[in-house]
């Protein structure tokens, strides 16, 4: 048993039929010595008396909010949560496996630049009675500071008959140098509590591997005289690391017809302009990627050809 | 990256072209190692990230762009010095870049070159003949060193009398390639920055 936060404890249980469970001793936080009674979840049934209560925690029926009272007055509470381990594997009932980039991916993280700021998000089909807390560090044996905000509900989506909820959190490495070569990964740990169930999820990554630039900005077309060609120009996104001559991007320019089946013309360039043929009803899109370290491409920025 | 790229003319700055070749060569070699050694721990998640140049060179600090010198987190061990004597910067007046930066890059290349050559000698003794270092990558390291044109003592190639442990050698190859790729990215960024200066 360990303390998650004040008056909230997690009991780790091997989950199999007729498992013996864990013996837990609860102590009432009071100077009083006698006349103390215990209840679970404010029911009228008295579980025991005395300053300590010994319970065998085997299942969810044994978890909950234990309260010690004296003469009708509440003295203290202890909330017991369960963390289930089945066949040596901790349960992952609360979050949805996003299966990207591989199976058992519950947390996904992205950074728009090398500033040490990143966002992580996760999905669940649970709508209420749910709390998350997020911690992060650089490395685990001698951890360096990363500060994370509160997790917030960032999106709701309908998937078939079911609703899916996306939560996200922003974190910032306390002393990050954009030019640094990372040798220790960032560790992100999410504690999830749904009613009486506790689970934890972790992700480990280098900022360089989760880089996804914002789309190029100010995408513009300039028709070339007496030609079907146009000059496409754009700029580095505002959120990208500077100086741009050090943190350089490479770009992919795509000409796409109205129909998805039409052949796409693609050009790759390190410059912030390109000359392409603009077909009627087509659109021109540009996306960006770190020039030297191939992490994710940005989303497309697009303009119509007309 | 295996994509058609319209690369700009390296122009006045020959090292930029060489550093781009270096990054391409080490990335290809790392990809080849990952594929060939698929049953070895060779991915970024599986390996220990070691830097053989740690405490010996200070490339990141020495080659820091001017704009980042205001960032306290980047200034842990920054040393300053002035104008370079390397040929890459011949006829270029620049207050940003010091000899220390390019000589630090040169020292990195020299250290990796020695390690790779020693490792290749061991891999050539492997009866499985599973993987060898790409000669193109070794040649590109050499070309960039020549372009940097620094004179420094030659480091003798390490020779080992004991029977090599080929499993350990292959894991060490993965570790080296990962670290060298990261350093090659830094070198490329630096050269790009210098080229624009």
């Amino acid at each position: 048993i360990w303390e998650l936060k004040k008056d909230v404890y997690v009991v780790e249980l091997d989950w199999y039929p007729d498992a013996p469970g864990e013996m837990v001793v609860l102590t009432c936080d009071t100077p009083e010595e006698d006349g103390i009674t215990w209840t679970l979840d404010q029911s009228s049934e008295v579980l025991g008396s005395g300053k300590t209560l010994t319970i065998q925690v085997k299942e969810f029926g044994d978890a909950g909010q234990y309260t010690c009272h004296k003469g009708g007055e509440v003295l203290s509470h202890s909330l017991l949560l369960l963390h289930k381990k089945e066949d040596g594997i901790w349960s992952t009932d609360i979050l949805k496996d996003q299966k990207e980039p591989k199976n058992k991916t519950f947390l996904r993280c992205e950074a728009k630049n090398y500033s040490g700021r990143f966002t992580c998000w996760w999905l669940t089909t649970i709508s209420t009675d749910l709390t998350f807390s997020v911690k992060s560090s650089r490395g685990s044996s001698d951890p360096q500071g990363v500060t994370c905000g509160a997790a917030t509900l960032s999106a709701e989506r309908v998937r078939g008959d079911n609703k899916e909820y996306e939560y996200s959190v922003e974190c910032q490495e306390d002393s990050a140098c954009p030019a640094a070569e990372e040798s220790l990964p960032i560790e992100v740990m999410v504690d999830a509590v749904h009613k009486l169930k506790y689970e934890n999820y972790t992700s480990s990554f280098f900022i360089r591997d989760i880089i996804k630039p914002d789309p190029p900005k100010n995408l513009q077309l300039k028709p070339l005289k007496n030609s079907r060609q146009v000059e496409v120009s754009w700029e580095y996104p505002d959120t990208w690391s500077t100086p741009h001559s050090y943190f350089s991007l490479t770009f992919c320019v795509q000409v796409q017809g109205k129909s998805k089946r039409e052949k796409k013309d693609r050009v790759f360039t390190d410059k912030t302009s390109a000359t392409v043929i603009c077909r009627k009803n087509a659109s021109i899109s540009v996306r960006a990627q770190d020039r030297y370290y191939s992490s994710s491409w940005s989303e497309w920025a697009s303009v119509p050809c007309s | 990256r295996n994509l058609p790229v319209a690369t700009p003319d390296p122009g006045m700055f020959p090292c930029l072209h060489h550093s781009q070749n270096l990054l391409r060569a080490v990335s290809n070699m790392l990809q080849k190692a990952r594929q060939t050694l698929e049953f070895y721990p060779c991915t970024s998640e599986e390996i220990d990230h070691e830097d053989i140049t740690k405490d010996k060179t200070s490339t990141v600090e020495a080659c820091l762009p001017l704009e980042l010198t205001k960032n306290e987190s980047c200034l842990n061990s920054r040393e300053t010095s002035f104008i370079t004597n390397g040929s890459c910067l011949a006829s270029r007046k620049t207050s940003f870049m010091m000899a220390l930066c390019l000589s630090s890059i040169y020292e990195d290349l020299k250290m990796y070159q020695v390690e790779f050559k020693t490792m290749n000698a061991k891999l050539l003794m492997d009866p499985k003949r599973q993987i060898f270092l790409d000669q193109n990558m070794l040649a590109v390291i050499d070309e960039l060193m020549q372009a940097l044109n620094f004179n420094s003592e030659t480091v003798p190639q390490k020779s080992s009398l004991e029977e090599p442990d080929f499993y350990k050698t292959k894991i060490k190859l993965c570790i080296l390639l990962h670290a060298f790729r990261i350093r090659a990215v830094t070198i490329d960024r630096v050269m790009s920055y210098l080229n624009a200066s």
């Epitope: 009932d93 089909t125 609703k163 009613k195 | -």
Partner: antibody, heavy 117, light 107 residues
């Protein structure tokens, strides 16, 4: 002793509104949700929504948004549900129940609402 | 929203019989399922929560099991006072939903 005491039966005209009360005793009102459930003969149990006075959160079944409104008075530990624009479809027994970790563990005795002209 | 399909709708049994009611969720609800008993003219009473945990004071002839989408409620030895309608309910994700109910009648 945990108890949820609901207000008495109501006979209402179509188009009118009704406010049902649910007085909670024997536990800390703020620690639990008060859920509201509708039961019509032959229709089983239908969850309308819930209200947590402790967090100020409401949780509605989409179907009853605009029909039901939840409020509470912490001084008397009483939860209320107002049903507006009543029609014959709203004729039912309405239950309040407390919920936290273990389903709806205590229920009120039910309030019968009949809508008839 | 999650649909709870409960079967059968009716059960006619003799005292002492074993009764099994099943509930199938339209998507995984982990073990967040409760079972209620509603006797004629009364409000529902909680019997089982977290799929298999008996609520305080509930006789041990009432048992529940299941995980994910398939849940079972059993009365091992039916007694005359068990005449009631039984409902399953998921409280994994709102809107909370109930099964259609199973009316248990004693011969």
């Amino acid at each position: 002793q945990v108890q949820l005491q609901q207000s008495g039966a109501e006979l209402m005209k179509p188009g009118a509104s009704v406010k049902i009360s649910c007085k909670a005793t024997g536990y800390t009102f703020n620690d639990y949700w008060i859920e509201w459930v509708k039961q019509r003969p032959g229709h089983g149990l239908e969850w309308i929504g819930g209200f947590s006075h402790g967090s100020g959160s409401t949780n509605y079944n989409e179907k009853f948004k605009g029909k039901a409104t939840f409020t509470a008075d912490s001084s008397s530990n009483t939860a209320y549900m107002q049903l507006s624009s009543l029609t014959s479809e709203d004729s039912a027994v309405y239950y309040c129940a407390r919920r936290r970790f273990r389903g709806m563990d205590y229920w009120g005795q039910g309030t019968s609402v009949t809508v008839s002209s | 929203s999650i649909v709870m399909t409960q079967t059968p709708k009716f059960l006619l049994v003799s005292a002492g019989d074993r009764v099994t009611i099943t509930c199938k969720a339209s998507q995984s609800v982990s073990n967040d399922v409760a079972w209620y008993q509603q006797k004629p003219g009364q409000s529902p009473k909680l019997l089982i929560y977290y799929a298999s945990n008996r609520y305080t004071g509930v006789p041990d002839r009432f048992t529940g099991s299941g995980y994910g989408t398939d849940f079972t409620f059993t009365i091992t030895t039916v007694q005359a006072e068990d005449l009631a309608v039984y409902f399953c309910q998921q409280d994994y994700s709102s809107p909370w939903s109930f099964g259609g109910g199973t009316k248990l009648e004693i011969k």
